[in-house]
C-alpha cells in the first residue's frame, strides 16, 4: 500500500542520504570527465547499442514514484540498485591507472550508501533478505569495452541517483 511523504523515516536519515547521493554524483561526474578527457568517450548515448550487447543492466525504481510511493518497496529497490552498481563497478576494475583512484572512491561511496539504506530498513523492521550473490555481470573482452562500459555504468548510475535524489527530497519535505 502507498505510504505518503510523512512516513516513518527520520529526517536525519533522509539528510544523510541526500548528502551521500550528492557525494556519489560528484564521484560519478569525476569518472565521466576523466573518461571523456583521457579516452574521448564523452557521449553515453553513442554507446547504447554496445551497452545492450555487453548486457549492462538498469536498476529499476518503479516503487518510488512520489504519487504512489511504497516505502518498503522503494527502499528495497534503492538498496538492490546500489548492490547492482557495486557489482558493475567491480567489473570495471583495472579500467586504467588514471581512473583507478576515482573508481575506488566511487565504489566505496556506493557501498556506504547501501549500508545507510539497509541500516534504516533494519531499524524499521523491513530489512530485505541478504542477496547471497551478484547476478551475472558483464564481461569486458577488451580495454575499449571496459572503458565504454565505464561510460555507460557511470551514466546509468547518475540517472539512478537523480531519481533517488528526487524521491529522498520528496520524503524529506515536511
Amino acid at each position: 500500500t502507498p505510504l505518503g511523504p510523512a512516513s516513518s523515516l527520520p529526517q536525519s536519515f533522509l539528510l544523510k542520504c541526500l548528502e551521500q547521493v550528492r557525494k556519489i554524483q560528484g564521484d560519478g561526474a569525476a569518472l565521466q570527465e576523466k573518461l571523456c578527457a583521457t579516452y574521448k568517450l564523452c557521449h553515453p548515448e553513442e554507446l547504447v547499442l554496445l551497452g545492450h550487447s555487453l548486457g549492462i543492466p538498469w536498476a529499476p525504481l518503479s516503487s518510488c514514484p512520489s504519487q504512489a510511493l511504497q516505502l518498503a518497496g522503494c527502499l528495497s529497490q534503492l538498496h538492490s540498485g546500489l548492490f547492482l552498481y557495486q557489482g558493475l563497478l567491480q567489473a570495471l576494475e583495472g579500467i586504467s591507472p588514471e581512473l583507478g583512484p576515482t573508481l575506488d572512491t566511487l565504489q566505496l561511496d556506493v557501498a556506504d550508501f547501501a549500508t545507510t539504506i539497509w541500516q534504516q530498513m533494519e531499524e524499521l523492521g523491513m530489512a530485505p533478505a541478504l542477496q547471497p550473490t551478484q547476478g551475472a555481470m558483464p564481461a569486458f573482452a577488451s580495454a575499449f569495452q571496459r572503458r565504454a562500459g565505464g561510460v555507460l555504468v557511470a551514466s546509468h548510475l547518475q540517472s539512478f541517483l537523480e531519481v533517488s535524489y528526487r524521491v529522498l527530497r520528496h520524503l524529506a519535505q515536511p
Epitope: 550528492r22 557501498a111 541500516q119 542477496q131
Partner: antibody, heavy 119, light 112 residues
Framework: QVQLVQSGAEVKKPGASVKVSCKAS????????MHWIRQAPGQGLEWIGY????????NYNQKFRDRATLTADTSTSTAYMELSSLRSEDTAVYYC????????????WGQGTLVTVSS | DIVMTQSPLSLPVTPGEPASISCRSS???????????LYWYLQKPGQSPQLLIY???NLASGVPDRFSGSGSGTDFTLKISRVEAEDVGVYYC?????????FGQGTKLEIK
Amino acid sequence: QVQLVQSGAEVKKPGASVKVSCKASGYTFPIYTMHWIRQAPGQGLEWIGYINPSIGYANYNQKFRDRATLTADTSTSTAYMELSSLRSEDTAVYYCARGGYGDSLFAYWGQGTLVTVSS
Amino acid sequence: DIVMTQSPLSLPVTPGEPASISCRSSKSLLHSNGITYLYWYLQKPGQSPQLLIYQMSNLASGVPDRFSGSGSGTDFTLKISRVEAEDVGVYYCAQNLELPYTFGQGTKLEIK
C-alpha cells in the same frame, strides 16, 4: 552491542606471511565494509584497505596492493587480513575498524593485533 | 594521496586550561555537497582509537561537549575548552574524501 574481536599477537620471521582475523558480532556483518589500519611502534595510523563482505570486493592502499589480501567469511562474520613477504618495517599493531558513512565511519575498532617481524 | 599535517606534535597542557590542535590537508576536503570530510580520533594510552568528531564539526555520540571542531577546506582545528586528565592521548585528524584514507602524524596531549 557491536564488537570486533581480533586474533592474538604473532611473531614472524622476515619473508613469512601472517593472517590476522577480526570476528564481528552485534550487527549484520555483510552489510558493512571492514577496514584495516596499522600502527608501527611510536608511529601514526596507516590505512591498508577495506573489504566489502557482501560482494567479496577488496580495495587496497597502493603501498600494500602487492602484499596484502583482505577476505571475509560471512558464515562466521569474520574478516581476515593476510600480509606476505614480511619485513621488519611491518612490525605494528594491526586494527580492523567497521566502515560506514558520517558518524558510522570507524566508530568501532578491534582491540588490535601486534605482529612482530624479527629474525 | 592527500597528505595530512598536524601541529604541534606534542602538547603539554595544565588541567582546566584550553588546548588547540591544528591539521592541514594538501587538498580541500570540502565536497560540492557542502560536507567537509575531516575526522578527529583520539587514541588513549594502551587503547584502540575512538571517534571524536566527524565531518569537521560534528561531535560523535558520547563525546563531551568540551570538544569542538572547526575549519575551512584545508585548515582545521580541534579545540578542548577545558582539558581534563582523561583527555591524554594521541589525537589524529583523518580525511575520508577519497581513497586512500589518510591520517595526520598525531598530536600527543599530555598533562603538565
